[in-house]
């Protein structure tokens, strides 16, 4: 009978303690958001947000530009200055809650926890293979916004997910925010909304469609928006929320919410429970 | 949505949607290239240890999700409507029964049942693609890509590692592209992952790391046989006494056969 080498067990054929060094960038603070841009002409960028700062990196992860996004009320805040002379709200650190691209312009949109959750639009300016941010535009029109009706209040300090959808020659922001009673009372960002960016980049159109957790449920019913994406004719949000309005709020489950990406309205808003199991 | 048995993992931790490669598509009974939503689920908010694995991965084909939703709308709005079927979403709108709009007893003739938000009455159930093999690993980030018709899950973990694993219905082991530590800090990899060209960007603590989609290298494959069985997209070959990519090998680099074992 032919003698054969004994088989090496599968686990013994690999070593996961092997060290690999991959390129990295040290942001100088906990990374809060990150988004990448790839242009048609070989230009690309990585945008990295930390508390009070936005870094622009080249494709090699080297720093190209850095912008102060806070603290609000600080004279060094470059985004705040775009809104004109202040004060615009209570002073405080800016945690970036939203960092998305509007590919049509193209532009980067950043929204933070300060200044009522307003957003800033930064046009992208290609420079060779790198990209720079133009001076920010403040997406906030003071005369359009009130605590109970604020089209320009986008980000919630408790977390916000945004997916940008192009319809015709316009950009619609599909926004989902976690709320509680305090956030809802102060320039409420709404739970789910569809907002249209104004042509002059002065904010979002005053009429927008929205759904919000009803005031009586705000204390006990909290929705976490985990992920959002656009594919085909729909935008989807993934949530973790209590299974019932009336039962134990700690009994959580996962839902998928579906919105039309072709009609900016919420009449065909649908939710479906996603159930994932381990069957030993 | 199928399986009711098994241990529920109700809390979604991270998710990503991507078109799938041929093998996984066959296993999911869908066409290659169709979009699938992948989610990493845990048992509770703290993701603490239960009886089973810490994290499980479920796959939800988007077309199936849409079909289930559309069927749910039909159940609510097309007669005969099952009595007692609720429109749901009582946290957003006044309670009502199908086919009535929220807060109204009956439909007015010019109001369409379909023009109001709805919670579909059935759920979509799936089972862990990895059959529990993630074990104690707590997955905190997920990005799915298709490479040479192979569907790969790129996962970040609570202890700062990256796992790149083929997404197939696992039998008794995971098919690793790689499993390595991002650095020495051991901080959790954050939820959001971005792609730039052939690289993925993961954040951990105050660092951003650029990881090749094809994997960081081949040195973790210890035997020539294992090295040459690695996926084609990894570009591995045997290089004297180690597994490496061609650029790492000054001498002979072999992709088609192993030296005889003595």
């Amino acid at each position: 009978e032919d003698w054969q080498c004994p088989r090496t067990p599968y686990a013994a054929s690999r070593d996961f303690d092997v060290k690999y060094v991959v390129p990295s960038f040290s942001a100088g603070g906990l990374v809060q958001a990150m988004v990448t841009y790839e242009g048609d002409r070989n230009e690309s960028a990585v945008f990295v947000a930390i508390r009070n700062r936005l870094h622009v990196l080249g494709p090699d992860l080297k720093s190209v530009q850095s912008l102060a996004t806070g603290p609000a009320g600080d004279p060094g805040c470059q985004t705040c200055a775009a809104c004109g002379p202040g004060p615009h709200g209570p002073p405080g650190d800016t945690d970036t809650k939203v960092l998305v691209l509007d590919p049509a312009l193209p532009a980067l949109v950043s929204c933070g926890s300060s200044l009522q959750g307003r957003c800033f639009l930064h046009d992208l300016e290609p420079q060779g293979t790198a990209v720079h941010l133009a001076a920010p535009a403040c997406l906030f029109s003071a005369h359009h916004n009130r605590p109970d009706d604020c089209p320009d209040c986008v980000a919630s300090p408790l977390g916000t997910r945004v997916t940008v959808v192009e319809q015709g020659q316009a950009s619609y922001f599909y926004v989902a925010s976690s709320l509680d009673a305090a956030v809802a009372a102060s320039f409420s960002p709404r739970s789910v909304s569809i907002r249209r960016l104004k042509a002059d980049a002065s904010g979002f159109a005053p009429g927008f469609v929205a759904l919000s957790v009803l005031p009586k449920h705000l204390v006990s019913y909290s929705i976490e928006y985990v992920h959002s994406f656009h594919t085909g004719a729909f935008v989807y949000f993934l949530t973790v929320q209590p299974a019932s309005v009336t039962d134990d709020p700690s009994a959580l489950h996962t839902r998928l919410a579906r919105l039309s990406a072709t009609e900016p309205e919420l009449g065909d808003y649908r939710e479906l429970v996603l159930d994932c199991r381990f069957a030993p | 949505g199928a399986p009711e048995g098994g241990q529920p993992y109700p809390v979604l931790r991270v998710a990503h949607s991507a078109p799938v490669g041929a093998q996984l598509a066959t296993e999911l009974s869908i066409a290659e290239g169709q979009e699938v939503l992948f989610g990493v689920f845990v048992t509770g908010k703290d993701g603490g240890p239960g009886v089973g694995p810490n994290s499980v991965v479920c796959a939800f084909p988007i077309d199936l999700l849409d079909t289930l939703i559309d069927e749910g709308v039909e159940r609510c709005c097309e007669s005969p409507v099952h009595p007692g079927l609720r429109r749901g979403l009582d946290f957003f709108q006044s309670p009502s029964f199908c086919p009535n709009p929220p807060g109204l007893e009956a439909l007015s003739p010019n109001t369409s049942c379909r023009h109001f938000p709805l919670l579909v009455s059935s759920s979509f159930s799936r089972v862990d693609l990895f059959n529990g093999l993630l074990g104690p690993v707590q997955v905190t980030a997920l990005y799915v890509t298709r490479l040479d018709n192979v569907t790969v899950a790129h996962m970040g973990t609570m202890d700062g590692r990256i796992l790149q694993v083929e997404l197939v219905r696992s039998l008794n082991y995971l098919l690793y592209v790689s499993n390595f530590s991002l650095g020495d800090s051991g901080q959790p990899v954050q939820r959001d992952v971005s792609r730039l060209g052939d690289h993925l960007l993961f954040a951990s603590g105050d660092q951003v790391f650029q990881v090749p989609i094809q994997g960081p290298g081949c040195r973790h494959f210890l035997t020539c046989g294992r090295c040459l069985r690695a996926w084609h997209f990894m570009g591995c070959g045997w290089c004297g006494n180690m597994c490496g990519q061609q650029k790492e090998c000054p001498g002979s680099w072999q992709q088609d056969h192993c030296p005889p074992k003595l």
Epitope: G39, D40, R41, P103, A104, L105, P106, P126, P151, E166, G168, Q169, A170, R196, L197, K198, A199, D200, A205, P206, G207, F208, P264 | -
Partner: antibody, heavy 117, light 111 residues
Framework: EVQLQESGPSLVKPSQTLSLTCSVT????????WNWIRKFPGNKLEYMGY???????YYNPSLKSRISITRDTSKNHYYLQLISVTAEDTATYYC???????????WGQGTSVTVSS | DIVMTQSPLSLPVTPGEPASISCRAS??????????MNWYLQKPGQSPQLLIY???NQGSGVPDRFSGSGSGTDFTLKISRVEAEDVGVYYC?????????FGGGTKVEIK
Amino acid sequence: EVQLQESGPSLVKPSQTLSLTCSVTGDSITSGYWNWIRKFPGNKLEYMGYISYSGKTYYNPSLKSRISITRDTSKNHYYLQLISVTAEDTATYYCARSKYDYAMDYWGQGTSVTVSS
Amino acid sequence: DIVMTQSPLSLPVTPGEPASISCRASEIVDNFGISFMNWYLQKPGQSPQLLIYAASNQGSGVPDRFSGSGSGTDFTLKISRVEAEDVGVYYCQQSKEVPPTFGGGTKVEIK
């Protein structure tokens, strides 16, 4: 300064294809929307269609079966093709840029096309 | 398609005097709290230039004497004090529905 320049034949025979080029300088056609509009004798303006930053197109349904708008990003050019032309297609053809909502802020100088045998 | 009707067809003006042009849409062109109405001027021998977008916003480099107003279906372009260089054909354009459609034009000429 953004500039657009139309070019192409000024005379096309009936049933043939009208082909025009719009050359763009001062901006990249990989951002915004790039439109074609025509003006008939008697001043009537008709919107024809656009190609977007991503290459997506929209065509006026009245022209849908005959029109095609394409682009070459390496040249920063975009193109109009109108097949099976008739005398009714005699017009001055303009290319124009819009950033948002079909508000066209930069226009070419226009090129006059006559359809005649 | 939305039909845009401009009046008057022709408008003789005196330099230094105000002038106004009306545009009516066959259906409401407002949505999301915005009026999707743009105004253009085509001077003799030139291509059209954007004067006003979203009913009341001035285009880049447009003199302050041009203003737009209106909502729903009725819109107005006003020139506070006409100058000789303002002659040409003025067009309104709706962009709420595709295809975008233009008015028939108003020819402004010096008396």
